[in-house]
């Protein structure tokens, strides 16, 4: 019998200092073009090698981002949330919203004690 | 590899209005980051404007603060070709002006364009305001 996959989804808030070539991730989504059904919010598709994302090391593809410096990105076309990205200064607070997967083990499994056979 | 070619520039009176062309080959084009540089005598290479396909159904662009209102980046995706109108020209326009590409299909950027991005050029095509 399959497993059951739960996510268990985290917030927290990002600080990044913009390097010499920008904050180094892309996004996707946004009221014009959702990525997720349903959902017009703006996620991370891609964080880019020696970026200052990726030198920061906790913002992570798949990672939804909720606010750039306090400012919220729900309701935002894709292109105004990308303005809003590169209009964002040199210091950049992101809050995120990460969704990580977890595997369950099958029902009826043995219990925590019970060996192995 | 990806072969770009410029074509439509000249010479023009201030005022007055151009169009560039830039035609794409050797790569799907729709995955394809597009942008205009120019560089005029004895000056860098300066970044103009920028449009990408974000792969979701949408363009992007992004100019720079003196082009803004006077020159519209568009790209047709069909004929694998990317725009530049420019009106209202000024004298500070003359330069040699760039197309470049970058690949770059996943989402947008959030960063401003930087000519270090691109990896495929044109040969430039000279543009002249008296």
């Known amino acids: 019998m399959n497993g059951r996959v739960d996510y268990l989804v985290t917030e927290e808030e990002i600080n990044l200092t913009r390097g010499p070539s920008g904050l180094g991730f892309n996004i996707v989504g946004g009221t014009d073009q959702q990525y997720v059904s349903n959902d017009s919010g703006i996620y991370v598709s891609r964080i880019k090698e020696n970026g200052a994302a990726a030198l920061d090391g906790r913002l992570q593809e798949g990672d939804k981002i909720l606010s750039v410096n306090g400012q919220d990105l729900k309701n935002l076309l894709h292109q105004d949330a990308v303005d809003l990205f590169r209009n964002a200064g040199y210091a950049v607070s992101l809050r995120v919203q990460h969704r990580l997967q977890v595997q369950n083990g099958p029902i009826g499994h043995r219990g925590e004690g019970d060996p192995s056979g | 590899e990806v072969q770009l070619v410029e074509s439509g520039g000249g010479s023009v009176q201030a005022g007055g209005s151009l169009r560039l062309s830039c035609a794409a080959s050797?790569?799907?084009?729709?995955?394809?980051?597009m942008a205009w540089f120019r560089q005029a005598p004895g000056k860098e290479r300066e970044f103009v404007a920028e449009n990408w396909w974000n792969g979701q159904g949408g363009q992007g662009v992004w100019y720079v603060d003196s082009v803004k209102g006077r020159f519209t980046i568009s790209r047709d995706n069909a004929k694998n070709t990317l725009y530049l109108q420019m009106n209202n020209l000024k004298p500070e326009d003359t330069a040699v002006y760039y197309c470049a590409a970058h690949r770059d299909d996943s989402g947008s950027t959030v960063d401003p364009p930087n000519q270090s991005d691109y990896d495929y050029w044109g040969q430039g095509t000279q543009v002249t305001v008296s």
């Open positions: 050797g790569r799907t084009f729709s995955s394809l980051r």
